[in-house]
């Protein structure tokens, strides 16, 4: 297993509609033609698996249906949305990339991204 | 236990066409690239072609690049390989083999081989 | 056309040491090929011994290791057995998903 270098923002903010949004670089060293980006989120120094999936390169990255991850490719950039967060999701989330084939297989994790997710307060009912 | 079993091979005419199979159990079969290699008689053995786990990726030895198509069926655990335009050269003893762990450097289970005679 | 290179012939006395080598007709064999060893009796299948270099397959005996001696990969066999008698293979990674074997070595052990 080779080590590879993942580039991540340290930090997003996620919309008011529980929307996170960020890139995840790597610095590829072969001619991976399959790519595996898993995404990890850390909290209380337990981490758990968010969402994965593996693309070909110059392909759109294709999640499982029922994920909350949606993404898109751009050479060795990968653009991901997380939908549906809550307060309760705030953590460091880690890109994981694999570069899966043809050999030899690459191995990068990034330093994770903290999303921070605020509930939007309730409007309050108004008289008219 | 891995296990590796092939069918598919015969005799046929310069300029027909054959199709090898190789029947997978014993593991993830979708997790690991496959190879077909090849042993001419009395000759070496000779990498014919291979495909990664998914089958999105495939490659191939310029000698058969354009003739032959690697495939897989990970829904049946098999994995084929469609042989167009043989020729005599193309008679061989064909061997599947698995590529070896996620890192897919060398080949750790083959088959027990299925002969190919190309012959008028 | 890259050619990969094994001795065509070997001979070793039982109990002796032999070592095989696999190199490449234009530059020098490194870890960075991944080379592999095969061994292969007549009419059967290959059998792993060797991947990544120096990684002995599962139910390889330790007699069998693997290594890079100066330009080229190598197989060395300790203390050879009569059944130690085969065809030996090398298969070097040429990058972008191609393989290359080499031309075999025929060891005798006597």
């Known amino acids: 297993c080779k080590a590879m270098h993942v580039a991540q923002p340290a930090v997003v903010l996620a919309s008011s509609r529980g929307i996170a949004s960020f890139v995840c670089e790597y610095a590829s060293p072969g001619k991976a033609t399959e790519v595996r980006v898993t995404v990890l989120r850390q909290a209380d120094s337990q981490v758990t698996e968010v969402c994965a999936a593996t693309y070909m390169m110059g392909n759109e990255l294709t999640f499982l249906d029922d994920s909350i991850c949606t993404g898109t490719s751009s050479g060795n950039q990968v653009n991901l949305t997380i939908q549906g967060l809550r307060a309760m999701d705030t953590g460091l989330y880690i890109c994981k990339v694999e570069l899966m084939y043809p050999p030899p297989y690459y191995l990068g994790i990034g330093n994770g991204t903290q999303i921070y997710v605020i509930d939007p307060e309730p409007c309050p009912d108004s008289d008219f | 236990q891995v296990q590796l079993v092939q069918s598919g091979g015969g005799l046929v005419q310069p300029g027909g066409s054959l199709r090898l199979s190789c029947a997978a159990s014993?593991?993830?079969?979708?997790?690991?690239?496959m190879s077909w290699v090849r042993q001419a008689p009395g000759k070496g053995l000779e990498w014919v072609s291979a495909?990664?786990?998914?089958?999105?990726?495939?490659y191939y030895a310029d000698s058969v690049k354009g003739r032959f198509t690697i495939s897989r069926d990970n829904s049946k655990n098999t994995l084929y390989l469609q042989m167009n335009s043989l020729r005599a050269e193309d008679t061989a003893v064909y061997y599947c083999?698995?590529?070896?762990?996620?890192?897919?450097?060398?080949?750790?289970?083959w088959g027990q081989g299925t002969l190919v005679t190309v012959s008028s | 056309q890259t050619v990969v290179t094994q001795e065509p012939s070997f001979s070793v006395s039982p109990g002796g040491t032999v070592t095989l080598t696999c190199g490449l007709s234009?530059?020098?064999?490194?870890?960075?090929?991944?080379p592999s060893w095969y061994q292969q009796t007549p009419g059967q299948a290959p059998r792993t011994l060797i991947y990544?270099?120096?990684t002995r397959s599962s139910g390889v005996p330790d007699r069998f290791s693997g290594s890079i001696l100066g330009n080229k990969a190598a197989l060395t066999i300790t203390g050879a057995q009569a059944d130690d008698e085969s065809d030996y293979y090398c298969?070097?990674?040429?990058?972008?998903?191609?393989?290359?074997f080499g031309g075999g070595t025929k060891l005798t052990v006597l």
């Open positions: 083999a698995r590529e070896e762990g996620i890192t897919g450097t060398g080949f750790d289970y």
């Open positions: 014993g593991f993830t079969f979708s997790s690991y690239a």
């Open positions: 495909i990664s786990g998914s089958g999105g990726s495939t």
């Open positions: 234009s530059g020098s064999v490194s870890t960075s090929y991944y």
């Open positions: 990544t270099t120096n």
């Open positions: 298969v070097l990674y040429m990058g972008s998903g191609i393989w290359v």
